[in-house]
């Protein structure tokens, strides 16, 4: 599955929360970023994430109108030069400093599970999604026979009125 363009087709600044309305937050600790899933106090500011949407062509023999086989890939960047990465060996989600072009581990296939909630499937490990485990983000294998609407891989994107990232 290959990204069809080097530039994102759109970018979207949003706060990320779990299906149970816990916030995804990012903290700089000992020169590296940690990712937390936590309840925020009332009026506490939510961390913002820049989602960059890329088109990707799925390898397919299907004939079509140029539309079929296309999917949306996203990268997620909570702060300048840092992106969420899938560590498939450790089944973990980590923030790493990267330069463009970003590695495949930084790309996630976007699934809309409900009209206003999404899931993120690892590009490098199909069937594995970003999910919540023990108040942290982790990579969770979803059996294809299961309904993908399982709550621990569902996230809500809420719009922000701030136009600047970082």
């Amino acid at each position: 599955m290959s990204i069809t363009g080097i530039s994102p087709i759109t970018e979207y600044l949003a706060s990320l929360s779990t299906y149970n309305d816990q916030s995804i937050t990012f903290a700089l600790e000992d020169e590296s970023y940690e990712i937390y899933v936590e309840d925020l106090k009332k009026d506490e500011k939510k961390d913002k994430v820049l989602l960059s949407y890329y088109e990707s062509q799925h390898p397919s023999n299907e004939s079509g109108d140029g539309v079929d086989g296309k999917m949306l890939m996203v990268t997620l960047s909570p702060t300048k030069d840092f992106w969420l990465h899938a560590n498939n060996k450790e089944h973990s989600v980590e923030l790493h400093k990267s330069e463009k072009p970003l590695p495949d581990q930084a790309f996630f296939v976007l699934h809309n599970m409900h009209s206003n909630s999404v899931s993120f499937e690892s590009k490098t490990d199909p069937g594995v999604f970003i999910g919540v485990k023990d108040n942290h983000l982790a990579l969770i294998k979803v059996d294809s026979s299961e309904n993908l609407s399982t709550e621990n891989i569902l996230f809500k994107l809420s719009e922000t009125h701030h136009h600047h990232h970082h």
């Epitope: 009209s115 309904n147 993908l148 719009e159």
Partner: antibody
Amino acid sequence: EVQLVETGGGLVQPGRSLKLSCVASGFTFSNYWMYWIRQAPGMGLEWVSSINNDGGNTYYLDSVKGRFTISRNNAENTVYLQMNSLRSEDTATYYCAKGHYYYSSYSLGYWGQGTLVTVSS
Amino acid sequence: DIQMTQSPSVLSASVGDRVTLSCKASHNINKHLDWYQQKVGEAPKLLIYFTNNLQTGIPSRFSGSGSGTDYTLTISSLQPEDVATYFCFQYNSGWTFGQGTKVEIK
């Protein structure tokens, strides 16, 4: 070539039921959200209902909630719209559409030619 | 619910004119907006997705722009075959169409 063929439209009396079908071909049906959109004669487009690729989540326009049911059979590449308690204001051409991307509720990438539903006594 | 308002309702222009159609959302829709073209007696067709991305096979005279609540479809040089009704469509929160702009040739 992508094709969506709607059938099941026709003349029906108020309060009666009708079931529309949309048969898809030329793409991997089970990977796409599917939609029903309607257009009353001489009027604009109105989104009616959506169903996600595995059929687990469905959405409806407020005015059809409780009367219309969207469903899909991925083995038969078909999406349905069961319309009950039909009203004169449901008179429209009903279009079936597929999503633009795998797994995504963004954009209506391809539309069928539509089927006309007329509700009249 | 998000409302979409298109203006003008009818636009009459000459062949070769630059034509601008407007679509305004009742809330920020984060560029989650498409434009569709519908010719008389035909099904609608996707022209532009995610505000400014041209669908495969659509002539480059069509372009889209905008952000927040305000969006625009531009036809840089109107052609006879562009006579149609154009609809904007948001998918940021639920799904809503604008009421349409009918483009005619003077």
